[in-house]
Interface confidence: low
């Protein structure tokens, strides 16, 4: 067969859809691989062809577009299932071609089952709400294009297994779910079920997302360095191990990068000719405030090392802070016999 630009299996787009629900899947070629859209390709005389490989099979086969009630159909660059079946799971390929040009990409489609409480192996998107921040909304995701704007669907919202009715601070408003004041107790999985008619049939779209209540920007502060501090002195003799923890608290900030690093004599440890190791651990509070600890370790410290400046730095979107550790060389304990002898004026 003639050469075709094969983009391979696009595992980045692991598409999951629920069994017995409509699914519309756009050919990824136009979204991620080619620099033109379907309309341009179509008007240039290119044809979009779909085929698939069933789960646990190697054989590529055409998609059957002649099923009863047009269960599977193609519309422009979209492959439609009305509805999906469990055995639709497999790798799907869309190929764009004419006599001189060919480009194709495959992607995995997994049809998953859900129980009556909407539990399933589906990977859930996470939506973060600020704690005690005033009205915030989540929107029923990925329902565009399933029905025309003239169709008015019914939308039912659930928290876990329970229909959201008469909840204190959570109000369904059509496609939106409003949180009057988000609290930790609002953490959980929220499901919208969109029901709409089409050609005498009724279809359901189920969309579940995880709500995570996080720290509010109203309460956000610059990083706080708990250690090193002015109360602890790292007093060591040459040859001992020097361990200095840098522990920093970061307020939750959406899309913020939290960074902690050490400098030794104003340089990054990598740029200093001493054998230093740094180990990091991270923990999170219930509202995703973060505590990072970086432990600076010098196995066998020298008297030169004990004269250096050790500074812990931290930064987030709220600012940058730094704190120096108090490091000093331990004064050797007096040798008792010599001291005593000297005290008695012995020669």
């Amino acid at each position: 067969s003639e050469r075709c630009d094969d983009w391979g299996l696009d595992t980045m787009r692991q598409i999951q859809v629920f069994e017995d629900e409509p699914a519309r899947i756009k050919c990824p070629l136009f979204e991620h691989f080619l620099k033109f859209n379907y309309s341009t390709a179509h008007s240039a005389g290119l044809t979009l062809i779909w085929y698939w490989t069933r789960q646990d099979r190697d054989l590529e086969e055409p998609i059957n577009f002649r099923l009863p009630e047009n269960r599977i159909s193609k519309e422009k660059d979209v492959l439609w299932f009305r509805p999906t079946l469990l055995n639709d799971t497999g790798n799907y390929t869309c190929m764009l071609r004419n006599t001189t040009y060919c480009s194709k990409v495959a992607f995995p489609l997994e049809v998953v089952q859900k129980d009556s409480c909407f539990n399933s192996p589906m990977k859930l998107p996470v939506h973060k709400l600020y704690i005690e921040y005033g009205i915030q909304r989540i929107t029923c995701p990925n329902v565009d294009g399933y029905f025309p704007s003239s169709v008015k669907p019914t939308i039912t919202w659930y928290m876990g297994c329970y229909k959201i009715q008469n909840f204190n601070n959570v109000i369904p408003e059509g496609m939106n779910l409003s949180f009057l004041i988000a609290l930790i107790s609002n953490n959980g999985n929220y499901t919208c079920v969109v029901t709409y008619p089409e050609n005498g049939r009724t279809f359901h779209l189920t969309r579940t997302l995880t709500v995570k209540v996080v720290g509010s920007p109203k309460n956000a502060v610059p990083p706080v360095i708990h250690s090193p501090n002015d109360h602890v002195v790292y007093e060591k003799e040459p040859g001992e191990e020097l361990l200095i923890p840098c522990t920093v608290y970061f307020s939750f900030l959406m899309d913020s990068r939290n960074e902690v690093w050490w400098t030794i004599d104003g340089k990054k440890p990598d740029d200093i000719t001493i054998d230093v190791t740094i180990n990091e651990s991270i923990s999170h509070s219930r509202t995703e405030d973060e505590t990072r600890t970086q432990i600076l370790s010098i196995k066998k410290v020298t008297s030169e090392d004990l004269k250096r400046s050790y500074v812990c730095h931290a930064r987030s979107a709220k600012g940058e802070v730094a704190k120096a550790a108090k490091v000093k060389q331990k004064v050797p304990a007096p040798r008792y016999t010599v001291e005593l002898a000297c005290g008695f004026g012995a020669t």
Epitope: K218, M254, E259, R315, S316, G319
Partner: antibody, heavy 123, light 112 residues
Framework: HVQLQQSGPELVRPGASVKLSCKAS????????MNWVKQRPGQGLEWVGQ????????YYNELFEGKATLTVDTSSNTAYMHLTSLTSEDSAVYYC????????????????WGQGTSLTVSS | DIVLTQSPISLAVFLGQRATISCRAS??????????MHWYQQKAGQPPKLLIK???DLESGVPVRFSGSGSGTDFILNIHPVEVEDIATYYC??????????FGGGTKLEIK
């Protein structure tokens, strides 16, 4: 959509003071730094300072310490700049400008600007 | 404080040609990943408008004929092809570290 609406032109006497306002809409006011920028006629741009509405934290250009005071009223989503002991050197257009918030390391760009307030200091 | 030096002070180019504006910082405004350098366009009687942030990120809605490059201390704004509506003064701006933020002196773009 994001809008920054500034107060109208001001004509004041030397030695007096003035308070310029900048009303924000279309975004969560308290989560973005608000900056003030000065531009004298035919001249370039000069950063005056910035304020973080959620905490009231301020930073000033050293040249404007004691000259400008930045405040906010979070109930009305309004930022203010109070200028004192005015001289002809303070005659300029003053802009408020928001910094895009979601980049760490203090690398904030001024992504939305008010239309500017013209201040004329003259006897 | 970081000083930004823009050049040239003014620039006249033919329509459809390339305009190149340079901005040099007195010290580095880059860290691993990106640079805290931004470019603005100011037309007569209007407030400045953000064109490019972090040296090369085109702001939403800005035509692709504008592009930015550079890191460390040396940065470039390119406009190609220049159109009549691009007549304006262009400013670079750094926002490195704890403010003090500064602007370049500006470059006035005219059409020949």
């Amino acid at each position: 959509h994001v809008q920054l609406q500034q107060s109208g032109p001001e004509l004041v006497r030397p030695g007096a003071s003035v308070k310029l306002s900048c009303k924000a809409s279309g975004y969560i006011f308290i989560t973005y730094w608000m900056n003030w920028v000065k531009q004298r006629p035919g001249q370039g741009l000069e950063w005056v300072g910035q304020i973080f509405p959620a905490s009231g934290t301020t930073y000033y250009n050293e040249l404007f310490e004691g000259k400008a005071t930045l405040t906010v009223d979070t109930s009305s989503n309004t930022a203010y700049m109070h200028l004192t002991s005015l001289t002809s050197e303070d005659s300029a257009v003053y802009y408020c400008a928001r910094t895009d918030f979601y980049r760490y390391d203090g690398g904030y760009a001024l992504d939305y600007w008010g239309q500017g307030t013209s201040l004329t200091v003259s006897s | 404080d970081i000083v930004l030096t823009q050049s040239p002070i003014s620039l006249a180019v033919f329509l459809g040609q390339r305009a190149t504006i340079s901005c040099r910082a007195s010290q580095s405004v880059s860290t691993s990943g990106y640079s805290s350098m931004h470019w603005y366009q100011q037309k007569a009687g209007q407030p400045p408008k953000l064109l490019i942030k972090y040296a090369s990120d085109l702001e939403s809605g800005v035509p692709v004929r504008f592009s930015g490059s550079g890191s460390g201390t040396d940065f470039i704004l390119n406009i190609h092809p220049v159109e009549v509506e691009d007549i304006a003064t262009y400013y670079c701006h750094h926002s490195w570290g704890i403010p003090m933020y500064t602007f370049g002196g500006g470059t006035k773009l005219e059409i020949k």
